[in-house]
Interface confidence: medium
């Protein structure tokens, strides 16, 4: 049923995120005379679309109508239809796009011309669709968690408790975990920040703020795991990959056609023997870890230091929040607490690992096989990722706080993207120019 | 592979209630649409209506709307339809299936469970 | 609802063309994409999809079976009848949640 009008004046915009693995839509409200005020925009629903990211659909647009209409047809009641008009829509598509748009640029923008024109069908005000950068999407996140926690303003925050507390006004660094991609962002302490194309400045409720970002593509959790599965073929003597990243007794046939078919693996692309091998799984995590480990290339470092591939990275600076798949893969191993330390993850992913797949199928009968399977690469990925890819250690462990909702709205980057594309983030406080988009091209 | 096992056949009376399941394997409930069908000895394909187990969200076809519940516990993986005040008319075999999710080129039904209403 | 109708039963020779047709009362068509889908039913089993999308042709079915159609008339043919093929075909369309038509009976004359 439609709702009715609500009495006090508010306003809604709508975000949708085009992922790698899969699309959801955000629904934000706020109080329309309070719009540039910090922390007062709040997400009332997530939607998340079924079926894969919209990258899949190049072979098949005309399914990507029915594919987003459950969701927006949602926008349509949550959203009162006196406001329909004036709710902005966003889409924004991050890596797996990204990759698309490398492997065909035509091909990318038939997709994104027909999400575009199913999006224009509903009541809304339509702002387009676009493949946002990397640097974008590292940068709206860190403002995402920021805004969420309070940091960008001394004033009173709308709500009373902030979780992740601070006594000071330090703001939080930010790491982002996609399919296809993975984006560290933080304020370094004192340091220049070495590469230009990592450098960040803004200006937000009259602080300055001089920002490190990157974006690493091809290493999101699943095309890392391509990654890896090519690596590792490429030594296998027979069309049989016995693999530690998998649980003992876990079998899979994988088609060297979908191997080779993202641009993540082209670096060890070789002509093969066979058409198709099959994963055994031997649950091994150190085996894992150490093949993980492979895919960092750390011998080659043109900078004071870095994280790897010769990327420049300044000494890790204050609390992070790690949110999206670091999130949701280590809630589900039961990880995300504050009082677990880094040696007890990696204790505990040891033991999870070496869990035979029948056992494991069992103990989590509800899980789709597909994710499930994955969930010892993806926890040992991530603490490969964070202790020798971004060189957080076991004492600065504890200042990673997994992050999923702050307040009740999701961390990611959706939210900063539509702060800032609606000008709700003033450059001074109280209120002047607003950040231009222009700041993160 | 998806699986849907639903439970078995069931002989009532008129008035009472009946509650079917259909429990998924291979892939989690939240993943899809879940629908209701069922099919009259000798007649065709009726739908009842579809749950979206990821949000408890339901709708029901206009004719069940006051008589029919559609509910689904992710943790055990099952969906469920409940029909109250059966009638005669309402002997028929019930189906749970998945809404085909675009961008995949299948959908999965259950074997069917036969309810038979009956004085 | 939408409302659908098929044509009634038919008896095709073995290796004939079988023909079935499905009219809705309303279009079927949303944002540029025909949301209408065929099933085969025989005796005793579920419904198996085997066209969606009006034209798309499900994963593991025959190319024999094809589909074509927009708007409010749909057809959906059998080059080359087999036996295997004696079954009950459904039409539904799935714009508007699910409606099924009333099923058209393919047997061998």
């Known amino acids: 049923t439609q709702n009715k009008a609500l009495p006090e004046n508010v306003k809604y915009g709508i975000v949708l995120d085009a992922g790698s693995s899969h699309t959801s839509l955000y629904i934000y409200k706020w109080p329309a005379e309070k719009e540039n005020d910090t922390g007062v925009v709040h997400q009332v629903e997530e939607c998340r679309v079924k079926g894969p990211g919209i990258s899949k659909f190049v072979q098949k647009v005309n399914e990507i109508g029915i594919y987003l209409t459950d969701c927006m047809e949602r926008a349509r009641e949550v959203i009162p239809r006196s406001q329909h008009q004036e709710t902005p829509v966003y889409l924004g598509a991050t890596a797996g796009m990204r990759l698309l748009r490398m492997e065909s640029e035509e091909l990318a923008d038939r997709v994104l011309d027909v999400v575009e024109r199913s999006l224009s069908n509903y009541p809304f005000d339509f702002q387009g669709a676009r493949i946002i950068t990397g640097q974008e999407e590292g940068a709206y996140g860190w403002i995402t968690i920021n805004y969420l926690l309070g940091k960008f303003s001394q004033k009173t925050r709308w709500f009373s408790i902030v979780p992740y507390e601070t006594n000071n006004q330090e703001t939080f660094g930010a790491l982002d975990l996609g399919g296809a991609s993975t984006q560290v962002t933080f304020v370094p302490q004192n340091q220049t920040i070495e590469s230009p194309d990592n450098a960040l400045q803004f200006r937000l409720y009259g602080k300055d703020y001089n920002v490190y970002t990157h974006s690493f593509l091809c290493y999101g959790k699943d095309q890392a795991l391509w990654q890896k599965l090519a690596k590792d073929i490429q030594v296998a003597s027979n069309e049989i990959l016995r693999d530690p990243c998998f649980h003992p007794g876990y079998k899979k046939v994988v088609n060297v056609s979908d191997l080779y078919k993202t641009p993540c693996t082209k670096r060890f692309e070789m002509t093969l023997p066979f058409q198709q091998f099959e994963i055994q799984g031997i649950g091994n995590y150190q085996q894992c870890h150490q093949s993980i480990l492979e895919l960092f290339n750390t011998s080659y470092c043109p900078y004071s230091q870095c994280a790897f591939n010769g990327i420049f990275l300044p000494p890790l600076q204050g609390d992070f929040g790690a949110f999206s798949a670091f999130y949701f893969v280590m809630k589900f191993l039961n990880l995300t607490s504050e009082k677990v330390s880094q040696e007890k993850v990696t204790e505990m992913m040891k033991k999870f690992c070496a869990q035979p797949w029948e056992e494991i199928k069992t103990s989590y009968a509800g899980v789709k096989e597909k994710y499930l399977s994955e969930y010892c690469f993806s926890g040992t990925y991530i603490l490969s990722l964070l202790l020798q890819g971004y060189h957080f250690t076991a004492d600065s462990w504890e200042h990673i706080h997994f992050i999923g909702k702050i307040q009740g709205s999701d961390a990611g980057w959706t939210l900063g993207y539509m702060l800032n594309l609606t000008n709700m983030i003033p450059a001074e406080q109280p209120l002047s120019t607003p950040l231009s988009h222009s700041t993160y091209v | 592979q998806v699986q849907l096992v639903q439970s078995g056949a069931e002989v009532k009376k008129p008035g009472a209630s009946v509650k079917v399941s259909c429990k998924v394997s291979?892939?989690?409930?939240?993943?899809?649409?879940m629908h209701w069908v069922r099919q009259a000895p000798g007649k065709g394909l009726e739908w009842m209506g579809r749950?979206?187990?990821?949000?408890?969200?339901?709708k029901y076809a206009e004719k069940f709307k006051n008589r029919v519940t559609m509910t689904s516990d992710t943790s055990t993986n099952t969906v469920y339809m409940e029909l109250s005040s059966l009638r005669s008319e309402d002997t028929a075999v019930y189906y749970c299936a998945t809404e085909r999710v675009p961008g995949f080129e299948t959908d999965y039904w259950g074997q069917g469970t036969m309810v038979t209403v009956s004085s | 609802d939408i409302v659908m109708t098929q044509s009634p039963d038919l008896a095709v020779s073995l290796g004939e063309r079988a023909t079935i047709n499905c009219r809705t009362q309303q279009t079927v068509d949303h944002y540029g994409t025909t949301y209408m889908n065929w099933y085969q039913q025989k005796p005793g089993q579920p419904p198996k999809l085997l066209i969606y999308l009006a034209s798309s042709l499900a994963s593991g079915v025959p190319d024999r079976f094809s589909g074509s159609g927009s708007g409010t008339d749909f057809t959906l043919t059998i080059s080359s009848l087999q036996a295997e093929d004696v079954a009950v075909y459904y039409c539904?369309?799935?714009?508007?949640?699910?409606?099924f038509g009333g099923g058209t009976k393919v047997e061998i004359k």
């Open positions: 291979g892939d989690s409930i939240t993943a899809y649409f």
């Open positions: 539904q369309q799935s714009r508007n949640l699910w409606t």
């Open positions: 749950i979206d187990p990821d949000h408890e969200r339901t």
